[in-house]
Interface confidence: low
């Protein structure tokens, strides 16, 4: 229903602390350089607006759209262009223009320093004075470094973060009370944010029906006893949700994601058995939980999937009069047989399906044509699962770093224009993949590990897309999403890259390095991996782990020595030769 | 388009021997394990052996154990089915699929194999 005044409407469906939380991530997802002072107190402006447009509707401006309104204080801003350059020009543009080129100006890799997390102490100390501040630094903070982080999910991880210093503030050893809790949060909090963005580029570079047939696809899985006419529903509403979150509406984003899970839970019957722990929950936890629930239990007399898609008489007939539909029956029902699958491989067969109904419904024997479709799935599927098993193999062997190691040999070879520091982060975070899914039961490792490294790749692209740089990454990258991480997997050796000469300095070492955290000394480690393999491409794994090992010896000897400094000066050059020859 | 060719059956007698193969073509046939399937008149398709991508590994049906030996050539894209000691219960219709899968992986229409006297 239309309200008088938008702004209102949303302040009540949200209530005071969610609508000042999605606001300040609004504003610091938009404009990624404003300081949190800077932001709160525009919150603390459009708050007030709000609360008078609750008691008067019809008061001065209430009436604009939530984007005229926003982006009014965003222009308002000080020094935006000394600030931030092009972006200024939005401010000449008129809504929905406006908002459009605010959206294009978010930029995935800001030149902000990583987040650190101040000591158990300070923590302490600050959250307790001021809970409420607390907590906005860390939704400023997150949401300026992720500019498309899911917005009310960023309010449940900002509700996690605040029940942990809540309990470990009160221990004696806060410490070791909240650095694990803290990691694990934070690690979630990553790999949300990963997934969410690679919604958000399906959303825009594919447009709404790529998200709904992933959503189709996911939700069938999940929900393998709800009908087509259920999962149909749901698919749009969720496609609904993520639509205003990618499209910076985060307030009915925010609403619409609430309304959502009520209607779940008012429908389990027809939705699922395994919600009921979820509904139990309040508003921000209820949403987490629906949204990661575990899969229901298949119905155990679903016919054979060719009854309906190959062997029926019908099927170009059917097809024909509905293609969509008759496509998102074929992905429902393929889905809801195959929660051991990734989505991505769920939408390449449905894609193959597609295709060959096209193909085979303009012959003169159809049946004929499209009968072997079903055995034609069959490399699709192994492709998958033969990548799992080589991975998850590998990783057991050698453990997460040094299964990121491997990785980044892999991608530099096959990338090795990119950048070192893109690579490095590309594969610390392919490698985690290991740990986050060869470890789970058999038949959750491929979807675990598909959709995982997708995501993944899609920060790659993304951020390659800045500055195109290999002719192998923008191949696979202006593909469809679905067929990305299987272009990733083909690629080898790239054959038209010239290698970097040796040059000593980058293996140059000293002994500050002996004082950095165990992630900061392998990130030290890896850039040189990555290096050593831009020099030599097609380095053996043995050489390559020769001298690797030399250079751990080496950090390892001189970070034990009385003088850490000679050791570094006589030693270092000593290993630069050795690593020449090792290459030679 | 993924393309299986079976070849090699034929009728033999009890205790004879034949080799099965199978032509590949269409998808990377090194990177995929591949089954042989048999289905006999009136029963459901059953699968007599599998190999690995690199041959290193297989396994066989009980029914065949110590009998059947399959193999395969990557560089040929070929896959063989060794079968000694034949009895009237292995005929069937050989196929070749690709993966642990019993339904065929393409157009071909498996080989004949008729054990009698």
């Known amino acids: 229903e239309a309200h008088k005044s938008e702004i209102a409407h949303r302040y009540n469906d949200l209530g005071e602390q969610h609508f000042k939380g999605l606001v300040l991530i609004a504003f610091s997802q938009y404009l990624q350089k404003c300081s949190y002072d800077e932001h709160a107190k525009l919150v603390q402006e459009v708050t007030d607006f709000a609360k008078t447009c609750v008691a008067d509707e019809s008061a001065a401006n209430c009436d604009k759209s939530l984007h005229t309104l926003f982006g009014d204080k965003l222009c308002a801003i000080p020094n935006l262009r000394e600030n931030y350059g092009e972006l200024a020009d939005c401010c000449t543009k008129q809504e929905p223009e406006r908002n459009e080129c605010f959206l294009q100006h978010k930029d995935d890799n800001p030149s902000l320093p990583p987040f650190e997390r101040p000591e158990a102490e300070a923590m302490c100390t600050s959250f307790k004075e001021n809970p409420t501040t607390f907590m906005g630094h860390y939704l400023h903070e997150v949401a300026r470094r992720h500019p498309y982080f899911y917005a009310p999910e960023l309010l449940y991880y900002a509700e996690q973060y605040n029940e942990i210093l809540t309990q470990c503030c009160a221990e004696a050893d806060k410490e070791s009370c909240l650095t694990p809790k803290l990691d694990g949060v934070k690690e979630k909090a990553l790999v949300s944010s990963v997934r969410q963005r690679m919604k958000c580029s399906s959303m825009q570079k594919f447009g709404e029906r790529a998200f709904k047939a992933w959503a189709v696809a996911r939700l069938s899985q999940t929900f393998p006893n709800a009908d087509f006419a259920e999962i149909t529903k749901l698919a749009t509403d969720l496609t609904k949700v993520n639509k205003e979150c990618c499209h910076g509406d985060l307030l009915e984003c925010a609403d619409d994601r609430a309304e959502l899970a009520k209607y779940m839970c008012e429908n389990q019957a027809t939705i699922s058995s395994k919600l009921q722990t979820c509904c139990d929950k309040p508003l921000l936890k209820k949403a987490h939980c629906l949204s990661e629930v575990e899969h229901d239990t298949m119905p155990a007399d679903l016919p054979a999937i060719a009854a309906d898609f190959v062997e029926d008489q019908e099927v170009c007939k059917n097809y024909a009069e509905a293609k969509d539909v008759f496509l998102g029956t074929f992905l429902y029902e393929y889905s809801r047989r195959h929660p051991d699958y990734s989505v991505s491989l769920l939408l390449r067969l449905a894609k193959k399906y597609e295709a060959t109904l096209e193909k085979c419904c303009a012959e003169a024997n159809p049946p004929a044509c499209y009968g072997t479709v079903l055995a034609e799935f069959q490399p699709l599927v192994e492709e998958p699962k033969n990548l799992v098993k080589t991975n998850c193999d590998l990783y057991e062997k050698l453990g997460e770093y040094g299964f990121q190691n491997a990785i980044l040999v892999r991608y530099t070879q096959k990338a090795p224009q990119v950048s070192t520091p893109t690579l490095v982060e590309a594969a610390r975070n392919l490698g985690r993949v290991g740990t986050k899914c060869c470890t789970l039961p058999e038949d959750q490792r491929l979807p675990c590990v598909e959709d995982y490294l997708s995501a993944i790749l899609n920060r790659v692209c993304l951020l390659h897309e800045k500055t195109p740089v290999s002719e192998h990454v923008t191949k696979c990258c202006s593909g469809s999403l679905v067929e990305r991480r299987p272009c990733f997997s083909a690629l080898t050796v790239d054959e038209t890259y010239v290698p970097k000469e040796f040059k000593a300095e980058t293996f140059t070492f000293h002994s500050d390095i002996c004082t950095l955290p165990e992630k900061e000394k392998q990130i030290k480690k890896q850039t040189a991996l990555a290096e050593l393999v831009k020099h030599k491409p097609k380095a053996t794994a043995e050489q390559l782990k020769t001298v690797m090992d030399d250079f751990a010896q080496f950090l390892d000897t001189c970070c034990k020595a009385a003088d850490k400094d000679t050791c570094f000066s006589t030693e270092g050059p000593n290993l630069v030769t050795r690593c020449k020859d090792a290459l030679a | 388009q993924v393309q299986l060719v079976e070849s090699g059956g034929g009728l033999v007698q009890p205790g004879g021997s034949l080799r099965l193969s199978c032509a590949a073509s269409g998808f990377t046939f090194g990177q995929f394990g591949m089954s042989w399937v048999r289905q006999a008149p009136a029963k459901g398709p059953e699968r007599v052996s599998a190999i690995s991508s690199d041959g290193s590994g297989t396994i066989y049906a009980d029914s065949v154990k110590g009998r059947f030996t399959i193999s395969r050539d990557n560089a040929k894209n070929t896959l063989y089915l060794q079968m000694n000691s034949l009895k009237p219960e292995d005929t069937a219709v050989y196929y070749c699929?690709?993966?642990?899968?019993?339904?065929?992986?393409?157009p071909g229409q498996g080989t004949q194999v008729t054990v009698s006297s």
């Open positions: 699929t690709i993966g642990s899968s019993t339904t065929p992986s393409g």
